[in-house]
Interface confidence: low
């Protein structure tokens, strides 16, 4: 029942152009090129996209025309390899062009940079943005796609089209408003925050597929879709999982036209079959395509069917457990995961996957034993500690969050993680710990039944950021170990890390703790980041410092910044008071 089996097309590029329409075709090709060649100027990408689009139109007119039968990878790869400055801009990435498909595309994929050396996006004045929007709306929106795509090379392309649509709507509405800034800025903030979250979530999906394989992704999808659609039958969930896996494999592999096309087909299928999938889809299915796909992806869990029988009957008490397992291992484990997940919307997906892994390990051992039933009879008892561990961790951390508030909770995590993995770069520790700390405001407000899926699945996304950033420049064996051994045990692995006793403290450098008057003009967020950067450096210098000592130094530091920002001669204050603060802190910490 796969929705994606299509007749063979003479010209793949013509087929996708016709399916997607010119506007979406051009947008997706721009995203694809910007995600591959992240340093190229905007104008160069627009030129390449226009050339590809003109070529696609000739193929639509005549599918038998020259080169129209070539694969999209061949067409796009050839186009990327015409960039004159490839060698000087991208170095060894230029070697990809000497390869044949499919190796050439794999080579481009391997050179995607999760942390490209690009300037921070600075938001111009509202009037400047509105003028640019009115002067050339098309260029303005293309530039948005380009800037996001090059900074987020794994951003889910069809979802980026949805963001661009909202971006356009915000400018269309707000540039006519009486108070443009009051209308526009909150919308742009919301899009920025949602965009970062969307990028990080998709990055985990791609890491799951690329580092742990299709089976790992499918297991994740079975668990999540079974929670979301508990009334759907196993066969229906399996079909959705197969189709969803194809969509994400394509997007993560740079096949953005196929991905967007297949995602639209999947949304169409879900809406045509909502009666057998979920009662919550009605509103989503009334929306236009981009909104519809987004809405389905975010739809709330359907109500669990009443009177679901005990799981034990089929998976523990039955005499046929080993027979069923032996006949089709992955199908049987998939059914176990489906049945467990649909009964437990209160569990995180990663916990459900740990339970399934424990069940699998037990069956592997017990089905070879003299008395299999006796051997696996108590398997559900092994789940108890696995369930309690995240429950307790979330309870403790939400209590700490409520006690401290977000900023101080982030600081506690900064200290905790710097002590665990002090070799990791300071910007990465700050970024990751700040995001870990956001779990408090995101999830602790929820009732018990929603806390774990919110918190632990969010932490999986954030820890994946650490893993992909660390992979670029590996500095810690402990990080590598936690990131590569097991996808579902990453969070418990990091939680279990103690202070790294092998770490040799960093030499003290007064320059690291020298601050200037420019800190006074920073936004509250930027000021926090400055202070948190200093805190990480402090822990790297003095990893054995107590909480009390660190708190005292940070409180003194906050007071120093506040005092100097109120001073008439700010720069002199920062210079003189800063020296005193550093000396006092050194004395207090024994540096």
């Amino acid at each position: 029942r796969g929705v994606f089996r299509r007749d063979a097309h003479k010209s793949e590029v013509a087929h996708r152009f016709k399916d997607l329409g010119e506007e979406n075709f051009k947008a997706l090709v721009l995203i694809a090129f910007a995600q591959y060649l992240q340093q190229c100027p905007f104008e160069d990408h627009v030129k390449l996209v226009n050339e590809v689009t003109e070529f696609a139109k000739t193929c639509v007119a005549d599918e038998s025309a020259e080169n129209c039968d070539k694969s999209l990878h061949t067409l796009f790869g050839d186009k990327l390899c015409t960039v004159a400055t490839l060698r000087e801009t991208y170095g060894e990435m230029a070697d990809c062009c000497a390869k044949q498909e499919p190796e050439r595309n794999e080579c481009f994929l391997q050179h995607k940079d999760d942390n490209p050396n690009l300037p921070r996006l600075v938001r111009p004045e509202v009037d400047v943005m509105c003028t640019a929007f009115h002067d050339n709306e098309e260029t303005f929106l293309k530039k948005y796609l380009y800037e996001i795509a090059r900074r987020h090379p794994y951003f889910y392309a069809p979802e980026l089209l949805f963001f661009a649509k909202r971006y356009k709507a915000a400018f269309t509405e707000c540039c006519q408003a009486a108070d443009k800034a009051a209308c526009l800025l909150p919308k742009l903030d919301e899009l920025r925050d949602e965009g970062k979250a969307s990028s990080a979530k998709q990055r985990l999906k791609c890491a799951s597929l690329q580092k742990f394989g299709e089976r790992a992704f499918k297991a994740w999808a079975v668990a999540r879709l079974s929670q979301r659609f508990p009334k759907a039958e196993f066969a229906e969930v399996s079909k959705l999982v197969t189709d969803l896996t194809k969509v994400h494999t394509e997007c993560c592999h740079g096949d953005l036209l196929e991905c967007a096309d297949d995602r639209a087909d999947l949304a169409k299928y879900i809406c045509e079959n909502q009666d057998s999938i979920s009662s919550k889809l009605k509103e989503c299915c009334e929306k236009p395509l981009l909104e519809k796909s987004h809405c389905i992806a975010e739809v709330e869990n359907d109500e669990m069917p009443a009177d679901l029988p005990s799981l034990a009957a089929d998976f523990v008490e039955s005499k046929d457990v080993c027979k069923n397992y032996a006949e089709a291992k992955d199908v049987f484990l998939g059914m176990f995961l489906y049945e467990y997940a649909r009964r437990h919307p209160d569990y995180s997906v990663v916990l459900l996957l740990r339970l399934a892994k424990t069940y699998e390990t037990t069956l592997e051992k017990c089905c070879a034993a003299a008395d299999p039933h006796e051997c696996y009879a108590k398997v559900f008892d092994e789940f108890k500690p696995l369930v309690e561990e995240p429950q307790n961790l979330i309870k403790q951390n939400c209590e700490l969050f409520e006690q401290l508030g977000e900023y101080k909770f982030q600081n506690a995590l900064l200290v905790r993680y710097t002590k665990k993995v002090p070799q990791v770069s300071t910007p990465t520790l700050v970024e990751v710990s700040r995001n870990l700390g956001k779990v408090g405001s995101k999830c602790c407000k929820h009732p018990e039944a929603k806390r774990m899926p919110c918190a632990e699945d969010y932490l999986s996304v954030v820890l994946n950021q650490l893993c992909v950033l660390h992979e670029k420049t590996p500095v810690s064996d402990r990080v590598t170990k936690c990131c590569t051994e097991s996808l579902v045990n990453r969070r418990p692995c990091f939680s279990a890390l103690e202070v790294d006793e092998t770490y040799v403290p960093k030499e003290f450098n007064a320059e690291t703790f020298t601050f200037h008057a420019d800190i006074c003009t920073l936004s509250e967020k930027e000021r926090q980041i400055k202070k948190q950067t200093a805190l990480v450096e402090l822990v790297k210098h003095k990893p054995k410092a107590t909480k009390e000592q660190l708190k005292a130094v940070m409180d003194d530091f906050a007071a120093f910044v506040e005092k100097c920002c109120k001073a008439d001669d700010k720069e002199t204050c920062f210079a003189e008071e800063g020296k005193k603060l550093v000396a006092a802190s050194q004395a207090a910490l024994g540096l």
Epitope: C398, E399, F401, E402, Q403, G405, E406, S441, C444, K445, P447
Partner: nanobody
Framework: DVQLVESGGGLVQPGQSLRLSCAAT????????MAWFRQFPGKEREFVAA??????GYVADSMRGRFTISRDTKDTMILRLSSLKREDTAIYYC?????????????????WGHGTQVTVSE
């Protein structure tokens, strides 16, 4: 929007107790921290006590031991005043934040009740 309604104020003698209650109505209120402030004539509002969404209570140092804060339900907050003194005479205001954590500054609270008068007198 959110409405806060205080009740339980009144006239008591020194040394006696009172139970002030604050009920939140309007949109779903489960994520909010709530607090009590009091105001003496011609003075700024003074922080009394606060409680987080998760039920973590905090009472101002000068009142700790005599006043206790709790949540009856997620949208009802109770302040118990015992061993009342004449200087506790004031208007007591209920306040709520848009976030789940507590704060002691009045400016951090988005929603306010109209207040309930507590008078301690012979």
């Amino acid at each position: 929007d959110v409405q806060l309604v205080e009740s339980g104020g009144g006239l008591v003698q020194p040394g006696q107790s009172l139970r002030l209650s604050c009920a939140a109505t309007g949109r779903s209120f489960t994520t909010n921290a709530m607090a009590w402030f009091r105001q003496f004539p011609g003075k700024e509002r003074e922080f009394v006590a606060a409680i987080s969404w998760g039920g973590l209570g905090y009472v101002a140092d000068s009142m700790r031991g005599r006043f206790t804060i709790s949540r009856d339900t997620k949208d009802t907050m109770i302040l118990r005043l015992s061993s009342l003194k004449r200087e506790d005479t004031a208007i007591y205001y209920c306040a709520a934040r848009k976030t789940s954590t507590t704060a002691t500054e009045a400016t951090m609270y988005a929603y306010w009740g109209h207040g309930t008068q507590v008078t301690v007198s012979e």
